[in-house]
Interface confidence: low
């Protein structure tokens, strides 16, 4: 053999119970000691430091802390140095060294030592990762190194977590013993933070020890707090809140159209939108993600705003008899009431739509003029004016006539036409045609679609001359022999005596 000792590097005992520290040692055979003695020291292997003596086989002198509490269970002659400590208290926790004493110079303090831990709570062992929905094994482990007192285990707060399975007394690698009870169950997210307890009691004593472990159950996020759809007025401040329940806390991300707007590792995340515009109208998604899964929810943001100035598309110039189609469109939220007016008369209206189609079948000259498209919702009103020009062949109006006054004949030719016509006065008896370009004889004045041309003839006539007025544009020509009326019907003042 050779100098050496074998004992557990660490051993535990409940306060008030006992502990048996298993120990074997060896020495060279050629020493052949007559008697083998031994000493147990506390906290230091070196005698010159005067460490407390736990047990000494040569004498009964021990340190006062160990008086009546230590005895040797092993037979030193058989190289067994097992030590029993009774009624252990916290101050007995520490390192225990054995020194073999074979007489003469042959004393040897072994470097191998045992660290005694005085405990007062069972050790609940929870796997490093407990995931909701995955079966887990939780164990309660207590030292069982006291031959005089055996612990019994029971679980506390395990209701609904399955029935415990008692494994009983197990020998650990270094020769120490533990009592073990197992609990198998499938944790839920609600079990996170749950306090699970284990109780060790010693029959026929009042000794009872409890230990607790809080379950750290990992589970994927569930979004638990989220705005319902949000309506906001353009220019207002909008706050979108997303809150998720998960363990560990999730990475919360606010997104829109695949763009990350804000993210943080937190239980809730506020997205602040300052002075919202219609461009920010849409669906916002909150994504909550951790290592165990993800959840996402969306919220619709509806930005309310007054209508934009309507745009008008369509035919603005039409020929009499054609069908005219005009589209007035705008953008607003909510959709507006769209109305098309002409001279304060409603021609067409539509409620809560962004487009209004105006159909004018077989347009007539009366349809010519200024129109308004008005868009209105509760946030405002915008209007756009547009002009429809109806083109048609000349129409000679009934007020066309001639009138004589002394030495002057004035003829009025009143024409409604679009585009503006050319007007000519024909005097068949004289075989003369006077065009409007001859300013000396003809004066023309236009008001809207009506052109009034006035022919002035000077000099005496035996009888009123025949005057034919002809009006012409690209859509046709119309002629009318102008009737003569009495002087009292003339529309101008007679000047002179």
């Amino acid at each position: 053999g050779h100098w050496g000792a074998w004992m557990p590097s660490s051993i535990s005992a409940f306060e008030g119970t006992c502990v048996s520290i298993p120990c074997r040692f060896d020495f060279p055979d050629e020493l052949r000691p007559a008697v083998v003695h031994g000493v147990w020291y506390f906290n230091s292997p070196y005698p010159k430091n005067y460490p407390p003596v736990v047990f000494k086989s040569r004498t009964q002198v021990v340190h006062e802390s160990f008086q009546g509490r230590s005895r040797l269970l092993g037979d030193l002659g058989l190289r067994n140095c097992t030590l029993l400590l009774s009624n252990v208290s916290p101050e007995l926790g520490g390192k225990y060294y054995f020194r073999g004493d074979l007489g003469g110079y042959n004393q040897y303090t072994f470097s191998e030592h045992s660290v005694l831990d005085i405990v007062n709570t069972p050790n609940i062992v929870v796997p490093p990762e407990v995931v909701a929905g995955t079966e887990v094994e939780v164990s309660c482990m207590v030292p069982d190194n006291c031959p005089e007192l055996r612990p019994e285990l029971s679980w506390l707060g395990h209701e609904g977590l399955g029935e415990p399975a008692v494994l009983g007394r197990l020998r650990e690698d270094e020769g120490t013993w533990v009592q073990v009870s197992l609990l198998h169950f499938v944790p839920t997210r609600e079990a996170n933070g749950h306090r699970l307890g284990c109780q060790a009691s010693f029959p026929n004593t009042t000794l009872q020890f409890e230990g607790y472990a809080s379950m750290d159950v990992k589970y994927p996020p569930v979004i638990v707090e989220m705005n319902s759809s949000v309506e906001a007025i353009e220019g207002s401040h909008v706050s979108l809140l997303c809150g998720a329940d998960s363990n560990p806390p999730p990475l919360l991300t606010w997104m829109r159209d695949g763009t990350v707007l804000r993210e943080a590792v937190a239980e809730s995340l506020l997205l602040e939108l300052e002075e919202v515009t219609p461009a920010e109208d849409g669906v916002y998604a909150c994504l909550a993600e951790n290592a165990y899964g993800q959840d996402n929810r969306t919220v619709g943001l509806s930005v309310m705003y007054a209508p934009w100035k309507p745009t008008v598309n369509g035919t603005m110039v039409a020929v009499e008899g054609e069908t005219v189609s005009i589209l007035c469109s705008t953008q607003s939220n909510p959709d507006p009431i769209l109305t098309i007016f002409k001279e304060k008369q409603i021609l067409s209206t539509v409620i809560y739509e962004s487009e209004l189609q105006l159909e004018l079948p077989a347009v007539s000259p009366e349809d010519d003029g200024e129109y308004w498209c008005v868009a209105e919702n509760q946030y405002g009103q915008r209007a756009t004016a547009f002009n429809l020009s109806v083109e048609f062949a000349p129409v000679l109006l009934l007020e066309s006539h001639c009138a004589a006054a002394r030495d002057t004949v004035q003829c009025l030719c009143v024409v409604k036409s679009n585009p503006e016509p050319s007007v000519a006065f024909e005097l068949p008896s004289r075989n003369v045609t006077v065009n409007e370009s001859e300013r000396e004889f003809v004066y023309s004045e236009r008001s809207g679609l009506v052109l009034t041309s006035i022919l002035t003839l000077r000099g005496q006539a035996q009888a009123p001359p025949r005057v034919i007025c002809t009006a012409r544009n690209l859509y046709g020509a119309k002629s009318l022999e102008l009737p003569f009326q009495g002087a009292h019907r003339l529309m101008w003042a007679k000047i002179g005596p």
């Epitope: 990475l251 993210e263 943080a264 590792v265």
Partner: antibody, heavy 126, light 112 residues
Amino acid sequence: EIQLVQSGPELKKPGETNKISCKASGYTFTNYGMNWVKQAPGKGLKWMGWINTYTGEPTYADDFTGRFAFSLETSASTAYLQISNLKNEDTATYFCARNPINYYGINYEGYVMDYWGQGTLVTVSS
Amino acid sequence: NIMMTQSPSSLAVSAGEKVTMSCKSSHSVLYSSNQKNYLAWYQQKPGQSPKLLIYWASTRESGVPDRFTGSGSGTDFTLTIINVHTEDLAVYYCHQYLSSLTFGTGTKLEIK
């Protein structure tokens, strides 16, 4: 006006302890971290680390662990650098410099030092 | 740690001239998440503390004359001073703030 005013020059012996102060004004002290930068005579700049003025958590560069300690007196808007067991090689000018603190930590903002103290010369000589 | 190497270590130019100095990093300081280069330039005049000139490689700090321009990306960066003034006499340091913070070796600008 934003200012970082440091304590005056110090002459120390090896083995002694030195504490430099850096008083901030003109801004919210806890919105900006405080860095410490060493400049040995005629040498370049060497970052020593920084202290989060909001949480009080210090971060030390690899070469400045052990003898170096950053601390705060938030109520006085003052940061401190303490060097214990001074060595000759600690002779240098020490600058404090502020940097924005990113509270959210997701979008990485970096630590750009925009305002610096005037520097404190520490001379270690026996 | 990321090593920052500046060149030249010193240079002398006449007032009104243009000067260019280089800074190379041992690893890229371009952060892919935001496509920003975590590089700053500082000016340290004799007997003074450093002054921030440029950050994000090319953003000029407010109050810095537009004679100073930063450029580059990844590992190679340049500070250019056009129309050098006599008050530009200083040591210029590049500085990366992506990893544990490090400064360049410095470029000393002297005026002839």
